[in-house]
């Protein structure tokens, strides 16, 4: 139903606490450079205004759209142009163009220092002084670094953060209590951020149909007992919620998400038996629980897929009469039977089936043409299975660091134009997928690997779009969302690349490397490795092994030496000469 005042409606639905949190997230995600204090001031102004509208929905400006109210607030900031430059030009536009303009200025890679965690004592002191302000600061710092973070989920993580501090700040050993809890929150929040970023990219770059297909596959895997009609209803609501959050309409998004959770709990009998444990929880936990829910057991006695999608003489008629419904049904039926497949695989299979029908239904004897469709789709299943098996074998053999090195070489050969720090960052991220997924049982390995790779490649694509350097990367990123991973996997050595001239500076090390934490030491070595590949992209595996072995021996020798710097100065040039000879 239509409300006189949208902002009053959302304030009433969400309550003051969540309302303020969401306003803070909205401002922090759009104005990523502004200090916390400025945002707090604006949050209080918006909240006071909303309260006035609750008291009198007909009061001045209360009838305006929320996005317009936010836009007006932003455009009234006196220092907007000097802080944000051309973002201020958005203010000359009318809504909805102004909203779109603001969105385009969100920065996925803001130039902000890493979000460092203070010592437990300092954390607890600040928390006890003013816990609302402390949690507000957490929302602000996360939001400005992750401008597409799923806002209602961020409120959930803030609540978890608050609970951890409430408990651990009373503990005798604060660090022992806090560290594992905060590490777990951080890791989960980073995955959540990447998942939402993929959803927004899917909607923004590939459209609603792509997002709906993704959602049908995921929900069908989780709720295999639900009917297709029920899945479709949820997907329609979920699409609305996701569009709102991706579009920066966070109050509407959070409110509609609450409504969706309520609907699912009211209809849990026709969705999933697993919802029971979620539906007794309070608002934020309820929606989070549903998002993370374990998949339901498969219904017994499911008929063979071929019955409806191959043997049935009505296939082309059904395809012609309601193409999206028919393909949606295929995706639903296939996904609920295959919880072990990744979303990407399921969507590629559905795409392959669609392409086959497009071809066969135009023939005089369609059935003869599509009779073997499932056999023809088998390579779409075999390829990722084989890839995961090979990579997990390599991971088991080399360990995480060695596996990262192998990936650094592989990806530098695929896209040598990409900057060295970026290649190292992605080799490390891709390598960590081995740690996350390779130890899982066979049934979970495949989906774990491909679903994580989709998140990492999406981040790569977003950053590459900002500063494109490789046509091959652009092609893999933009042609098809579901074929991104196979596209990157299929890239080999870039034959068009002119090797980088040899710079001794890239391979010069000093004694300071010896005292670096292990992670930073690895990054330094991996930077050198990437530079080496850029210099000799066609070097063999054996040559690379030799060079890396010499390099490790050199570092060990000099870091163990009494006069470390002298060792580096003397042996460094010898190592560089030896490496050049090995690679010649």
């Amino acid at each position: 139903e239509a409300h006189k005042s949208e902002i009053a409606h959302r304030f009433n639905d969400l309550g003051e606490g969540h309302f303020k949190g969401l306003v803070l997230i909205t401002l922090s995600q759009h104005l990523q450079k502004s200090p916390f204090e400025e945002h707090v001031k604006l949050v209080n102004e918006v909240t006071d205004f909303a309260k006035a509208c609750v008291a009198d929905e007909s009061a001045q400006n209360c009838g305006k759209a929320i996005a317009t109210l936010f836009g007006d607030k932003v455009c009234a900031i006196p220092s907007l142009r000097e802080t944000y430059g051309e973002l201020a030009d958005c203010c000359a536009k009318e809504d909805p163009d102004r909203v779109e303009c603001f969105l385009q200025h969100k920065d996925d890679n803001p130039n902000l220092p890493p979000f460092e965690r203070p010592e437990p004592e300092a954390l607890c002191t600040a928390f006890k002084e003013n816990n609302d302000r402390f949690i507000g600061h957490y929302l602000y710092e996360v939001s400005r670094r992750h401008p597409y973070f799923y806002a209602p989920e961020l409120l959930y993580y803030a609540e978890k953060y608050k609970n951890a501090l409430t408990e651990c700040c009373e503990a005798a050993d604060k660090a022992a209590c806090l560290t594992p809890k905060l590490d777990a929150i951080k890791e989960k929040a980073l995955v959540s951020s990447a998942q939402q970023r993929l959803k927004c990219a899917s909607l923004q770059k590939f459209g609603e149909r792509a997002f709906k297909a993704w959602s049908v596959a995921r929900l069908s895997q989780k709720f295999p007992k639900a009917e297709f009609a029920e899945i479709s209803t949820i997907v329609t609501s979920l699409t609305k919620v996701t569009k709102e959050c991706c579009h920066g309409d966070l109050l509407e998004c959070a409110d509609d998400r609450q409504e969706l959770a309520k609907y699912m709990c009211e209809h849990q009998d026709s969705i999933s038996s697993k919802l029971k444990e979620c539906c007794v929880k309070p608002t934020l936990q309820k929606a989070h629980c549903i998002l993370e829910i374990q998949r339901d057991e498969l219904p017994t006695e499911l008929p063979d897929l071929a019955v409806d999608f191959v043997e049935d003489k009505e296939v082309c008629k059904n395809f012609a009469e309601a193409k999206d419904v028919f393909l949606g049904t295929f995706l639903y039926e296939y996904s609920r039977r295959h919880p072990e497949y990744s979303i990407g695989m399921l969507l590629r299979i559905a795409k392959g089936y669609e392409a086959k029908l497009e071809k066969c239904c135009a023939e005089a004897d369609p059935h003869a043409c599509y009779a073997k469709v499932f056999d023809e789709l088998q390579p779409l299943i075999d390829e990722p299975k084989k890839l995961v098996q090979q990579n997990c074998e390599l991971f088991d053999k080399l360990g995480e660091y060695g596996f990262q090195n192998a990936l650094a070489v592989r990806y530098t050969q695929k896209a040598p134009q990409v900057s060295t720090p970026t290649l190292v960052e992605y080799a490390r991220k891709l390598g960590s997928v081995g740690t996350k997924c390779c130890s899982l049982p066979e049934t979970e390995r495949l989906s774990c690997t491909e679903n994580y790779l989709a998140l990492i490649l999406n981040r790569l694509c977003i950053l590459h779009e900002k500063t494109p350097v490789s046509e091959r990367v652009t092609k893999c990123c933009t042609e098809s969302l579901v074929n991104r991973r196979p596209c990157f996997s299929a890239l080999h050595v870039d034959e068009t690349y002119v090797p980088k001239p040899f710079h001794a500076d890239s391979f010069t090390f000093h004694a300071d490397i010896c005292t670096l934490p292990e992670k930073e030491k690895q990054v330094k070595k991996q930077m050198a490795l990437v530079e080496l590949v850029k210099h000799k992209p066609k070097a063999s595996e054996e040559q690379m092994k030799t060079v890396m072995g010499d390099f490790a021996a050199f570092l060990k020798k000099c870091c163990d030496a009494d006069n470390k710097e002298a060792c580096f100065t003397e042996d460094g040039p010898k190592l560089v000469a030896k490496c050049q000879a090995t690679l010649a």
């Epitope: 296939v315 082309c316 012609a320 497009e358 239904c361 135009a362 005089a364 004897d365 369609p366």
Partner: nanobody, 115 residues
């Protein structure tokens, strides 16, 4: 919505001819092979003939081969069945269908072959 409207049926003597038409709408006509199916009183549906989306390939049931000709005009979204040398056993309701479907979408058109 998909719509198939058949026309051109009637009463004809054995050995006579008829031309059936099927006007299609609500889908991309050129992307689908089309078929004619018939159903005699008290019997199940029987496939008669099919044609590819481009019109280049045709298939016929043995019972009509050499007597019936299927064709299509993609510019008019229309499917045709030219029936020559009609026999009493050709008496049936004729339906056009999408792909190899045997179930009808339209109302059909009645062909009666009788002296």
């Amino acid at each position: 919505d998909v719509q198939l409207v058949e026309s051109g049926g009637g009463v004809v003597q054995p050995g006579g001819s008829l031309r059936l038409s099927c006007a299609a709408s609500g889908f991309t006509f050129t992307s689908f092979g089309m078929s004619w199916v018939r159903q005699a009183p008290g019997k199940g549906p029987e496939w008669v003939s099919s044609i590819s989306g481009s019109g280049s390939d045709t298939l016929y049931a043995d019972s009509v081969k050499g007597r019936f000709t299927i064709s299509r005009d993609n510019s008019k979204n229309t499917l045709y069945l030219q029936m020559n040398s009609l026999r009493p056993e050709d008496t049936a309701a004729y339906y056009c269908t999408i792909g190899g479907s045997l179930s009808r979408s339209g109302q059909g058109t009645l062909v009666t072959v009788s002296s």
